[in-house]
Structure formats: structure tokens, C-alpha cells
């Protein structure tokens, strides 16, 4: 209707890098740009996607490197991350939310695909990191080998060769495993302390140089003790698993302090596992009654968990792997390692700006049935699994309904802010719910819409619409963009109206009749009022038309609804030759060029393209006779 | 050769104060344990308190705890028991015996004892 | 606390006969348990360890032994310059905490 096409501003950037897969407005003091998502971008190596930031008027993008932010105290994997997949921009103070929904972490031998988003403030800086699926590995220990390097450990070479083995067994690194040596005899000694070395690599380095101290005493309360007091605390990490592997051939000179030891030990949750060498009694004949008993007494209850025995050093090799898996074992404590909970979460696939904080959507959270979370200045609520059953029944857990696919919400006069999420696979046909969070971590739905048809993907793209501009959502647009129909991916966006309390059906948006995929509806964006009716407006993207080059198409709002037939459809092709998948992504809330009207951003594979708005002329035609 | 030679008994009031000393010589108190037994007149022989020279861990019979205080220098290779709020069923010969590793855990050497009166 | 019973609290005996005491402990202990002999206005002397070894220095005649939680101090022949009184000990494990009987007094019969 009144979008130019004749003068577009059409932004290069790169195709492999799917530049333009997301575009958001931006206004920092009066200076506009456009935030381009590139989730394919390369840093380095690493395909981590980026973020750009481009000048509506002239000149080039600059790239963000938020694919450069790192996260401290984990071991991540930012290959793949996809930075740029879904970005929110918050209106009230002009940042933006940029996020990676594939960013992973290592957690002992698995990834962990939680999922990420870096805020950026107004002026462009990254200012924080939210990632509020983000848990603690299991491999979140400290490790401290309390080795008896006495005269009678004998070969030393064992002993060394053992310690190297279950190191290199160990998942060492920032957020996981830390490990410290301690050495005694008579004396107690530090070899290396737990936040010494940061790698397997480093710390089997160090472990391969740690010399036997000797000494006629064996000291082993003392040793246990000097690993408790110091040892635990110099590097060590809050929260951390305290583990601790005694490693000794012969009876203690000071087992009368062991009972007090042992009690301190177990007052600060420190796990013990302890090996007994019987190589010095095995050569002298000796019975090792009472050696065995004490080192049960030392290890950690059960002790077939946590006491070992060998009848020599050699043999130490020989427990590398049953020592090593008992103490991974503490990892699936009372978990049912069959399910996920918030592991493969992939948090930021889509992202909300809402008052107090953010909404993420998880599509793979709980199984792959989803989730959304929310992230607040006061904290994060992350809903229980059973909270979702009401509209997620038990028997649909394994079909993987992907809620959070979409995020937004809607405000009615009477609920005031109700949140939306998307399930675009849920029971194969797609569905939305309405609902409100709580901070127990419990749900209530207040509504839920279902898609008709299999494949549709309905829900994988919603939008609230508040038309009139009074605060109160009128119409909530939910897209089924795999629609088929006549043989093809056509695509269909429902129409919902609010009525008192409930979203009604009200038809749906009439799309352009070809005979070709269009998936209209991939993207659908609410956006102010762009023919100067005083009515918000809605444009819905359809990036496989005209053989995936791509086109949109311009709603006007009107009285409390949308009228269902497209004022202005705009294709690629009348706008630049080579765009693709034009329409992939819209934003329309600010005006880029100062004439006092709102310009649309929409992204293309490769390219971010913004369309002026033109003035609409309102001729009103009357009709005077004279003579009358 | 080892020995052990408790000093500081005497005779105390009721609610007094009193510490003993344990010089040892022959061995070194930083790798060994050192015990106090007491003996009443004509009774047998109760524990009273030990220390870890080593670890300064103590340990006390419940009849003393609270009241006495067992430490150790192992510069002065000496041993002491800081007897306070005496009773007079504390009067006693007090000894102070070796206990460590090599003995198997037994009491392999004694003091003379000294003798600690409690009276008003 | 582990209670070490002592019996009997007297015994008389001839020179060359054999003596046996024993100590019973109130609840399954370790071999630490030892044995002491005192004279009057002296210092116990250390006679067994670990319920069975001889301490260095002492006669053969003396010897322990254990079964369950019942240990023996036996004096094959004694001797004139065994008449004294007799102590059992136990250490409780991995602590310092010790325990006396009540004594045994082997007098001239």
C-alpha cells in the first residue's frame, strides 16, 4: 500500500553465514541502526554465529563478536552455537538480547546443550551473560590425592605410572574437575595445588616430575587432615564435590588421631576413597589384618564403594578403571540418567522482553517436549516438568513437542500479562498455550489452542497484536508456516480475538494464490501503525515464495481486529535481484529516516533490507454546485 | 635411654590450681602420644587425658573434662596438665606413659609419678 | 564407652603355679589390648601388646591371648617377684581414648 519498493536499502552481508536470519530495529539516542543476526558467522575456527550492528542510512556493519564472550568456570564448546538465532529487544532502555541456543558445555564425557544469551546495553556493549539453564556439572569436583611417599612404597615408578592413569581418566577443566596432590611421610607437602593446572595435559605433566619424599613414619591421619584443612582450600571452589583418594601401603604412626580426622572430614562432606598396597606385607610375609581395617576405616562408607586393595604397586594399575567409574559414579546420584531435564535445553531458541525480565524458550528441555524460562534481576524461574502436564500429557513425552519454539505474550484487562509459547510439534499438529509463571516454579495454562493439521508446524511463530494502542492485546496471530495445501507448503496464520477473557478463533490471513511453497507465516511481526490510521499493523512473512526468493505481506489493523486481506504484498524480486528467503525475519516499531513514519526491516539470506514508508494522502472528495 | 619424670604435684585446696610436668628424654614427643593415668590411694589405675604432640588432638575422661587441660611443648620435649577447680577425689599419684606406634599402641613407658593432694 | 571387666579382682597362688586372668570387653574391640603389671609405690610395667606379643625384657612365662571379647594373661609358673597387681588396657581405635580394669592383686598364698 504505502511501502516504497522502489527505493529499498538493501544490506550485504554473508549468505553462509545466513546474515539477515533475524533483524531488529535499534535507536540509541536518536541514532538508528539496524541488529542483523548471523547465526552461521565464523569466529576464529569456530562457527559460533554473530551479531552485527548496521547503519540505516549508509555505511557498513560491523560485527559485535558477542561469539567472542566466554563464560568463566566451564569447559564450553561454542562450534555451532548459533548466536543470532533469536534476538529481543527491550524498548525501555534500548538493549538487546542476542542468543545461542546450541552453546554447550562439557560436562564429564557428555555435552550439554543448555543454550545461552549475552545481553548487549544500548550503546552496543555486551553486559551480561543469561543463562539460566545453565547447571553445575557433576563434574564439579575437587580431587585431592593424598599419596604416602614413605620409605617402604617401593617401586616409586608404580605409583607414578597409577597417578598419570587416573588422572588422564579425569575430566579436568574450568567448571569441571580440579585436581591437587598432597605427598606425606613424616611430613606433609604440597605437590601442586587444585587450581594449579587447568588440563589433563598439565596436571599428568606435573604428576610425571612428583619425586617420592620418603620418610621412616607414615603419618596418614595427618596427611588426610592436611588435605582436608589445606589442601581443599587452597583453589578450591565453593560448591565443588570434595573428593579425596589416599593411596598408602602400611599402618599409620598416628591412627589414634584418625577418628577425629575422619569426623572432620565428614563434617565437610569430603568423599573418600582409599587404596591399600599390600606390597610391603606381601614381602615380609606380614598379616595385613590391621592395615585393612584401618584403611576401611578411612574410606568412605560403603566401603565396596570406596575401599580398594592391591597386592602390590604394580598391581595399582589394575584399579585405574574401577576407581575412576566409582568416582563418576557420584554424577548420576538420584538421577535417572535415561531423562533430560534442562541438559539439552537449548534456552534463547526464542526470547521476550517482558517488565520484569526475559522469557526463553527451551524447545529441548524436559525431553524435547520444552519449556520456557524466565530470567529476572531477582533470579530465574525455571517451571518443573509436571507443571506443563495439563496440556503435555505423560503419554505424549516422547514426541517431542519443542515448546518455547516461540515466545511472547499478551496483556488482558483482566489477567493483565499472560505469556504464549508455541509447541509447534506437539501431538504432530502444533500447539499454543497461554499462561502465567509463579515463582514456586509451578504453571497455571489458562488456554490452550491446538493446530488442525499434521506437519503444520502450528505455533512455531505467534504474535500479539494490541491494534488500537490502549496496552490491551486485541488479536494473537499464530503461524502453521508448513500448512499444506493444493499440493504445497503454503502456509496459514490464524486469527485469535480477545473476548473477555479468551482468545476466540476468528479465521485466517489471506496469503497470495500460487502454486508454489511459500511457508507465509514463518515470521509474523506486529508493527506500528505503518498507513497512518492510527491502527498498529501486521506483516507476515512468506521466504519460499517465488521459488524462495521470498515476499511479505501488509495487514492493516482495523477497529479491535486485522482486516484478513493483504493491503500490500511485496515480493523479492521487485526489490533487488538475488535476495532469497526474503521475509525470514520483520521488524517494524521505529521510524529509521526521521520523516515522522515507520520503515520495515526484513531479513533475507544474506541481507537485511529496510523499506521507507510513504505519507498517505487522505483526499476526501466533496461535491459544491453552484448555483446550488 | 627413654624416661619420663613427672614434676608439680603438692598439695592444693579444694577449687585450687595445679600443672604437671612430663620431661621426656631418650625419644622425641613429636612422634609419639603422651598419656596421664592416675592412681588413687589404694585404687586402680584411670585414665585421665592424652595429647597428639604431633596434631595437638586431645582426648579427656569424662571425670576431668572441662576442668583440665593436657598440651605439649615439643621444643622443651615436655608435656603438661593444667589442673584446675581441683576436688578432692583428684588426689592421686599422677603418671604420664609413652604411647605409640611402635608398641602397638601400649603404654611401653612411665613416669615415677607425682603425687597430687586435694585437702583443705 | 567400651567397659573392660577384670576378674578376678584377687586371686592367691603358690610359687610355680599357673595364673590366668582375664579381661572381658562390653563390646567387640581390637587386639590393642594390653597388660601391666604394678608393684607398690611404683609404676606399671608394660608385660603384653596387641593382646599376645611380649614386650622386650619380659619373661617368657607371661603370655596373652584372645578369644572374641575375652582376653588372658597367663603366668605358666609363677615366680616370687610376680606378686603384684595386674591391669588390662584397651585403646579404642583410631583414637587415644583408653581403658583400664579394675585390676587384679595376686597375693601369696
Known amino acids: 500500500f504505502n511501502m516504497d519498493t522502489r527505493k529499498p536499502r538493501v544490506i550485504p552481508g554473508s549468505r553462509t553465514a545466513f546474515f539477515g536470519y533475524t533483524v531488529q530495529q535499534h535507536d540509541i539516542s536518536g541514532n538508528k541502526w539496524l541488529v542483523v543476526g548471523a547465526p552461521l558467522e565464523t569466529n576464529g575456527y569456530q562457527k559460533t554465529g554473530d551479531v552485527y550492528k548496521c547503519p540505516v542510512i549508509h555505511g557498513n556493519c560491523t560485527k559485535l563478536n558477542l561469539g567472542r564472550v566466554t563464560l568463566s568456570n566451564v569447559s564450553e564448546r561454542k562450534d555451532n552455537m548459533r548466536l543470532g538465532l533469536s534476538l529481543a529487544t527491550n524498548p525501555k532502555d534500548n538493549s538487546f538480547l542476542a542468543c545461542s541456543p546450541l552453546w554447550s558445555h562439557e560436562c564429564g564425557s557428555s555435552y550439554y546443550t543448555t543454550g545461552m544469551c549475552s545481553r548487549v546495553n544500548s550503546n552496543f556493549r555486551f553486559s551480561k551473560t543469561v543463562a539460566p539453564a545453565l547447571q553445575r556439572c557433576q563434574t564439579y569436583m575437587d580431587i585431592v590425592i593424598v599419596l604416602d611417599g614413605s620409605n617402604s612404597i617401593y617401586p616409586w615408578v608404580e605409583v607414578q605410572h597409577f597417578l598419570i592413569n587416573i588422572l588422564k581418566k579425569f575430566y579436568i577443566g574450568p567448571g569441571q574437575i580440579q585436581v591437587g596432590v598432597v605427598q606425606y611421610g613424616e611430613d606433609v607437602v604440597h605437590e601442586f595445588h587444585l587450581n594449579d593446572y587447568r588440563s589433563v595435559k598439565d596436571v599428568v605433566e606435573a604428576a610425571s616430575h612428583i619425586e617420592q619424599r620418603g620418610g621412616t613414619e607414615t603419618r596418614t591421619a595427618f596427611g588426610i587432615e592436611f588435605a582436608r584443612s589445606e589442601a581443599f582450600q587452597k583453589g578450591g571452589r565453593k560448591g565443588a564435590k570434595k573428593v579425596m583418594i589416599v593411596i598408602t601401603d602400611g599402618e599409620s604412626h598416628d591412627s589414634p588421631d584418625l577418628e577425629k580426622v575422619i569426623q572432620q572430614s565428614e563434617r565437610d562432606n569430603v568423599t573418600r576413597y582409599a587404596v591399600a598396597v599390600l606390597g610391603y606385607y606381601n614381602r615380609r610375609g606380614i598379616n595385613p589384618e590391621t592395615f585393612l581395617n584401618e584403611i576401611k576405616y578411612i574410606a568412605s562408607d560403603p566401603d565396596d564403594k570406596h575401599f580398594f586393595n592391591v597386592t602390590d604397586e604394580a598391581a595399582l594399575k589394575d584399579i585405574v578403571d574401577a576407581l575412576g567409574d566409582r568416582i563418576f559414579s557420584l554424577e548420576g546420584t538420584n538421577k535417572n540418567e535415561t531423562s533430560f531435564g534442562l541438559e539439552m535445553s537449548q534456552t534463547g531458541f526464542s526470547s521476550h522482553v517482558v517488565e520484569d525480565g526475559v522469557l526463553l524458550g527451551a524447545v529441548g528441555a524436559y525431553d524435547w517436549n520444552g519449556a520456557v524460562l524466565k530470567e529476572t534481576s531477582a533470579g530465574k524461574v525455571i517451571p518443573l516438568r509436571e507443571s506443563y502436564l495439563k496440556e503435555f500429557p505423560e503419554e505424549l513425552k516422547n514426541h517431542g513437542a519443542y515448546l518455547g519454539y516461540t515466545v511472547t505474550s499478551v496483556v488482558s484487562s483482566r489477567q493483565g500479562r499472560v505469556y504464549v509459547a508455541g509447541a509447534p510439534r506437539f501431538n504432530h499438529t502444533g500447539k499454543v498455550i497461554l499462561f502465567t509463571m509463579h515463582n514456586n516454579r509451578s504453571l497455571t495454562i489458562h488456554q490452550a489452542m491446538r493446530g488442525q493439521q499434521i506437519g503444520s508446524y502450528f505455533g512455531s511463530e505467534i504474535t500479539s497484536v494490541d491494534i488500537d494502542g490502549d496496552g490491551v492485546t486485541d488479536v494473537l496471530l499464530v503461524g502453521a508456516p508448513m500448512y499444506f495445501n493444493e499440493g504445497r507448503e503454503r502456509g496459514k496464520v490464524y486469527v485469535y480475538e480477545l473476548r473477555q477473557n479468551l482468545f476466540v478463533y476468528n479465521g485466517t490471513l489471506k496469503d497470495s494464490h500460487s502454486y508454489q511453497n511459500a511457508r507465509f507465516g514463518s515470521s509474523i511481526a506486529s508493527v506500528r501503525d505503518l498507513n497512518q490510521d492510527s491502527y498498529n499493523d501486521v506483516v507476515v512473512g512468506a521466504p519460499l515464495e517465488d521459488n524462495h526468493a521470498g515476499a511479505i505481506y501488509i495487514f492493516h489493523g482495523f477497529r479491535g481486529s486485522i482486516l484478513k486481506t493483504p493491503k500490500q504484498r511485496i515480493t523479492a524480486s521487485e526489490l533487488a535481484t538475488g535476495l532469497q528467503y526474503f521475509g525470514c525475519s520483520i521488524h517494524g516499531q521505529l521510524d529509521l529516516n526521521e520523516d515522522g513514519l515507520i520503515d520495515l526491516a526484513v531479513g533475507a539470506l544474506g541481507n537485511a533490507v529496510i523499506l521507507w514508508s510513504r505519507p498517505v494522502v487522505q483526499i476526501n472528495a466533496s461535491l459544491h454546485f453552484e448555483p446550488s | 635411654e627413654v624416661q619420663l619424670v613427672e614434676s608439680g604435684g603438692g598439695l592444693v585446696q579444694p577449687g585450687g590450681s595445679l600443672r604437671l610436668s612430663c620431661a621426656a628424654s631418650?625419644?622425641?614427643?613429636?612422634?609419639?602420644?603422651i598419656h596421664w593415668v592416675r592412681q588413687a590411694p589404694g585404687k586402680g589405675l584411670e585414665w585421665v587425658a592424652s595429647?597428639?604432640?604431633?596434631?595437638?588432638?586431645?582426648y579427656y575422661a569424662d571425670s576431668v573434662k572441662g576442668r583440665f587441660t593436657i598440651s605439649a611443648d615439643t621444643s622443651k620435649n615436655t608435656a603438661y596438665l593444667q589442673m584446675n577447680s581441683l576436688r578432692a577425689e583428684d588426689t592421686a599419684v599422677y603418671y604420664c606413659?609413652?604411647?605409640?606406634?611402635?608398641?602397638?599402641?601400649?603404654?611401653?613407658?612411665w613416669g615415677q609419678g607425682t603425687l597430687v593432694t586435694v585437702s583443705s | 564407652d567400651i567397659q573392660m571387666t577384670q576378674s578376678p579382682s584377687s586371686l592367691s597362688a603358690s610359687v610355680g603355679d599357673r595364673v590366668t586372668i582375664t579381661c572381658r570387653a562390653s563390646?567387640?574391640?581390637?587386639?590393642?589390648v594390653a597388660w601391666y603389671q604394678q608393684k607398690p609405690g611404683k609404676a606399671p610395667k608394660l608385660l603384653i601388646y596387641?593382646?599376645?606379643s611380649l614386650y622386650s625384657g619380659v619373661p617368657s612365662r607371661f603370655s596373652g591371648s584372645r578369644s572374641g571379647t575375652d582376653f588372658t594373661l597367663t603366668i605358666s609358673s609363677l615366680q616370687p617377684e610376680d606378686f603384684a597387681t595386674y591391669y588390662c588396657?584397651?585403646?579404642?581405635?583410631?583414637?587415644?581414648?583408653?581403658?583400664f580394669g579394675q585390676g587384679t592383686k595376686v597375693e601369696i598364698k
Open positions: 606413659a609413652r604411647y605409640w606406634y611402635y608398641s602397638a599402641w601400649a603404654l611401653d613407658y
Open positions: 631418650g625419644f622425641n614427643l613429636y612422634s609419639s602420644y
Open positions: 595429647i597428639s604432640s604431633y596434631s595437638s588432638y586431645t
Open positions: 563390646q567387640s574391640v581390637s587386639s590393642a
Open positions: 596387641s593382646a599376645s
Open positions: 588396657q584397651q585403646s579404642a581405635p583410631y583414637s587415644s581414648l583408653i581403658t
